[in-house]
Interface confidence: low
């Protein structure tokens, strides 16, 4: 530190507004105007009551992980810029963030950056023709019910559409003839006989994430003989099904990577 009366250099925190889909990484950049000899950089989130909650801290090229390992601070090569990232952002990560810097003694000074806003949006449902998700104020169970009913209705509509197309293209089908490839082939019996409509919803999130690691299946209406809705066995995305601590990418570095890494 050069002198006790050294002027403080401002901090910037960008972008001022950041929007990511849930499950994606959200990265802000905290920048120092110059590089003090010894300093601590803290990353904060503003709580609803305007309190600052510390997410992570950085000093002298070592990071002290906070309680939630999803929050990471990385110093960039230029030494002045720091990436502050949320690994696998969740809907409830939406909010106001900032960084703060502390010069160490003898001229201890504290400064905070301007605020920045993060918006984490729900992952877009597939296919794009899917009806829009219900407003956030709907409870998790109600939302699950709405999605279930919507799924059945879409299935019914598709089935009716297909029936209409078949009726138009193959008029004989309406007179009870077999619609299979060969008239000689007997009509297939069993579960595969009916057409199967695969509605790929991607990762359905029924907002029960906080209650259970794996959301229970939504209650489906009883009358579902019109279509079979197949949910493909896709692995869950880290931000949605896996706990933060199970993410390999979100693990704190091993002690060999550097000092100052503390056990939980």
């Amino acid at each position: 530190l050069d002198s006790p009366d050294r002027p403080w250099s401002p901090l910037t925190f960008s972008p001022a507004q950041l929007t990511v889909q849930e499950g994606e990484n959200a990265t802000f950049t905290c920048s120092l105007a110059d590089i003090p000899d010894s300093f601590v950089l803290n990353w904060y989130r503003l709580s609803p009551r305007n309190q600052t909650d510390k997410l992570a801290a950085f000093q002298e090229d070592r990071i002290e992980p906070g309680r939630d390992r999803r929050f990471r601070v990385t110093r960039l090569p230029n030494g002045r810029d720091f990436h502050m990232s949320i690994v696998a952002a969740r809907l409830n990560d939406s909010g106001i963030y900032l960084c703060g810097a502390i010069y160490l003694p003898p001229n201890t000074q504290i400064n905070e950056s301007p605020r920045a806003e993060l918006s984490v949006t729900e992952r877009t449902l597939e296919p794009p023709t899917q009806s829009p998700s219900p407003p956030p104020r709907l409870s998790g169970q109600l939302q699950g019910l709405v999605i279930g009913v919507t799924s059945v209705l879409v299935g019914v509509l598709l089935l009716l559409l297909l029936t209409w197309v078949l009726a138009a293209v193959f008029p004989r089908a309406t007179r009870g003839a077999c619609v299979c490839g060969s008239e000689d082939e007997p009509l297939k019996e069993g579960p595969d006989a009916a057409p199967v409509f695969t509605l790929d919803y991607g990762e359905l999130d029924f907002q029960w994430r906080e209650k259970t690691p794996e959301p229970p299946a939504p209650c489906a209406p009883e009358q579902t003989e019109y279509a079979t809705i197949v949910f493909p066995g896709r692995p869950a995305s880290p931000g949605r099904r896996a706990s933060a601590s199970s993410l390999q990418g979100a693990q704190p570095p091993s002690p060999e990577d550097g000092p100052g890494l503390w056990p939980p």
């Epitope: 010894s38 002298e60 090229d61 070592r62 502390i102």
Partner: antibody, heavy 118, light 113 residues
Framework: QVQLQQPGAELVRPGASVKLSCKAS?????SFWMNWVKLRPEQGLEW???????????HYNQKFKDKAILTVDKSSSTAYMQLSSLTSEDSAVYYC???????????WGQGTLVTVSA | DIVMSQSPSSLAVSVGEKVTLSCKSS????????????LAWYQQKPGQSPKLLIY???TRESGVPDRFTGSGSGTDFTLTISSVKAEDLAVYYC?????????FGGGTKLEIK
């Protein structure tokens, strides 16, 4: 001017508990970790642990995990260390010390002499 | 835990003499990412609390006389007092802040002849 005020002495019975205080002034209390260190003449200095006054996060030396509990009262800028199940081995001077960042202990209190005696 | 060893445990010197205190760690305190050694030196005078002298192994704390110099890297460190004064009578401790738990050396007691 940074100051850490600690009571001079505490006399306690074996098996009892004691809660030591450390009142901070002259700096932003919630900005820096508060550490606690034990000094016995023959054993030298031992680091007990530290607490972040900002959110009460704690890190302990495993040796003192079941002996000490570190807390803070932000409203009064005071850090506390409660020592339980005291024995003669716990007779020592206990210091609080501020830590700027994750580094050296910059400022120390005057220490509290704890004497465990029947 | 990182073990810190100091030597000698005590020594008596005359005013004006040069003194060298040694501190060794059981593992390197040098962090390759920033080439800094995570070691501090403290002075504890009789009846007083410890006082920070040196951090980052060689950075003198504000207000500390320039006769105190810290040096060394990795596992071997030295605190040198270029010309001892009577007020330097104290116990000197080294401490690593590289990893949890922070550990101190056993101390070197400096006595004045």
């Amino acid at each position: 001017q940074v100051q850490l005020q600690q009571p001079g002495a505490e006399l306690v019975r074996p098996g009892a508990s004691v809660k030591l205080s450390c009142k901070a002034s002259g700096y932003t209390f919630t900005s820096f970790w508060m550490n606690w260190v034990k000094l016995r003449p023959e054993q030298g200095l031992e680091w007990i642990g530290r607490v972040d006054p900002y959110d009460s996060e704690t890190h302990y030396n495993q040796k003192f995990k079941d002996k000490a509990i570190l807390t803070v009262d932000k409203s009064s800028s005071t850090a506390y260390m409660q020592l339980s199940s005291l024995t003669s081995e716990d007779s020592a001077v206990y210091y609080c010390a501020t830590q700027f960042g994750f580094s050296w202990l910059a400022y120390w209190g005057q220490g509290t002499l704890v004497t465990v005696s029947a | 835990d990182i073990v810190m060893s100091q030597s000698p445990s005590s020594l008596a010197v005359s005013v004006g003499e040069k003194v060298t205190l040694s501190c060794k760690s059981s593992q390197s305190l040098l962090y390759s990412s920033n080439q800094k050694n995570y070691l501090a030196w403290y002075q504890q005078k009789p009846g007083q609390s410890p006082k920070l002298l040196i951090y980052w192994a060689s950075t003198r704390e504000s207000g500390v006389p320039d006769r105190f110099t810290g040096s060394g890297s990795g596992t071997d460190f030295t605190l040198t007092i270029s010309s001892v004064k009577a007020e330097d009578l104290a116990v000197y401790y080294c401490q690593q802040y590289y990893s949890n738990p922070y550990t101190f050396g056993g101390g070197t007691k400096l006595e004045i002849k």
